[in-house]
Interface confidence: low
């Protein structure tokens, strides 16, 4: 038996909700890495980048025994980077695609830029509440990176408890259940 | 030191309403939920449900929704039970409870004293 | 809603004896996040119940050592190793793993 002060914080993506809901296509981008052809008249097979994309995403946070009251909506930095979209009131727009050639050693990719902390307050089935701080992305960027660079994957793992109300606090197995009966 | 002191004894006709109180004290009333339960003479014990105190918000068992309302009166960190209606059934020792931490994962721990509700014409 | 189930509903004891009582639940009590949020209680005349056991086998602050949980999904155990006099009483088990929050009938610890 062990009581201490450690809490991890798993997060479930519930429900992400697409920067332009009429388009189901936007969900696929976040599974696919982000990868999107412009619509613009353009030969489909000409693979020009709409612009980073911000997905933006609804979950409930979880510590494995009590939710968060209201979900938390953030973005989420989908995938790769190419050029700005060569629409056709661009300037420069016959240039574009040409310009941003992908070169076979660097790709773009489309990473968390800006981020801020948030308090949150989570519910336990008997009515208690926490507080956690959370940190959450606020702006996407692209970046360029070489071929051999890890990929650093986005971590909606990464919360820490704000200061606690009490000291003992269970610790929380890694488990990232749904369940929430837990009284 | 935790205490959560309890209203006394009452005895009410059947129809009548009945309201007990649960006075915390000790820790942070709005930090932990407020459970019910209820104890029929001679028998086991059944939970009734719980009031967030932070929020308010009531959530009752299967059994105890209707008739049955918790309040509470967070400036003076107390919970309240009300039983509208009262019926014979419902004579029986009404506990407050708290949990050991922030929820009842690591038990009930802290019990008021109970009050007894008696129903009777 | 789960079911917990206490063996026997009275144990008659001597003092010094050792003493068990079986509690089975309807359902698994492990909780996904592989805690299992059994507990034992007991309940003097005229008291309050006070918590003895939680999680299945911790004993809760100034709860003797004479008293130990054990078991796991649906089938556990309270034993009192040299039971007291001031042992005697209703001891219940409860289950916190699944809403609502349920106990044991209860089992009446007397002197034979």
């Known amino acids: 038996f062990k009581n201490d002060a450690t809490e991890i914080l798993y997060s479930h993506v519930v429900k992400p909700v697409p920067a332009h809901p009429s388009s189901n296509s936007t969900l696929n981008q976040a599974r696919n890495g982000g990868r999107h052809f412009s619509n613009t008249g353009l030969d489909r097979n000409t693979r020009v980048q709409v612009g980073c994309r911000e997905l933006r995403s609804t979950k409930y946070i979880s510590d494995g025994q009590c939710t968060s009251i209201s979900p938390l909506k953030e973005l989420v930095c989908a995938g790769e980077c190419l050029p700005l979209p060569v629409l056709p009131n661009w300037i420069g727009g016959g240039y574009g695609t040409k310009y941003w050639s992908r070169r076979s050693s660097q790709e773009w990719r489309c990473v968390n830029d800006k981020t801020r902390t948030q308090r949150i307050q989570l519910q336990c089935q008997d009515g208690s509440t926490r507080t956690y701080k959370i940190t959450v992305v606020t702006a996407c960027k692209c970046k360029r990176y070489t071929r051999q660079h890890n990929e650093s994957s986005h971590n909606f793992e990464s919360m820490s408890p704000a200061k606690p109300v009490q000291h003992h606090r269970e610790r929380k197995r890694a488990s990232k259940s749904s369940k929430h009966s837990m009284s | 030191q935790i205490h959560l002191v309890q209203s006394g004894p009452e005895l009410k006709k059947p129809g009548e309403t009945v309201k007990i109180s649960c006075k915390a004290s000790?820790?942070?009333?709005?930090?932990?939920?407020m459970s019910w339960v209820k104890q029929a003479p001679g028998k086991g014990l059944k939970w009734m449900g719980w009031?967030?105190?932070?929020?308010?918000?009531?959530t009752y068992a299967d059994d105890f929704k209707g008739r049955f309302a918790f309040s509470l009166e967070t400036s003076a960190s107390t919970a309240y039970l009300q039983i509208n209606n009262l019926k014979n059934e419902d004579t029986a020792t009404y506990f407050c409870?708290?949990?050991?931490?922030?929820?009842?994962?690591?038990?009930?721990?802290?019990w008021g004293q109970g009050t007894l509700v008696t129903v009777s014409a | 809603d789960v079911v917990m189930t206490q063996t026997p509903l009275s144990l008659p004891v001597s003092l010094g004896d050792q003493a068990s009582i079986s509690c089975r639940s309807s359902?698994?009590?492990?909780?996904?996040?592989?805690?299992?949020?059994l507990h034992w209680y007991l309940q003097k005349p005229g008291q309050s119940p006070k918590l003895l056991i939680y999680?299945?086998?911790n004993r809760f602050s100034g709860v003797p050592d004479r008293f130990s949980g054990s078991g796991s999904g649906t089938d556990f155990t309270l034993k009192i190793s040299r039971v007291e006099a001031e042992d005697l009483g209703v001891y219940f088990c409860?289950?916190?793993?699944?809403?609502?929050?349920?106990f044991g009938a209860g089992t009446k610890v007397e002197l034979k």
């Open positions: 409870v708290r949990g050991r931490e922030y929820y009842y994962g690591s038990g009930i721990a802290f």
């Open positions: 000790g820790f942070s009333f709005t930090t932990y939920g």
């Open positions: 009031i967030n105190t932070y929020s308010g918000v009531p």
């Open positions: 359902q698994s009590l492990e909780h996904s996040n592989g805690n299992t949020y």
């Open positions: 999680k299945v086998s």
């Open positions: 409860s289950q916190s793993t699944h809403v609502p929050l349920t």
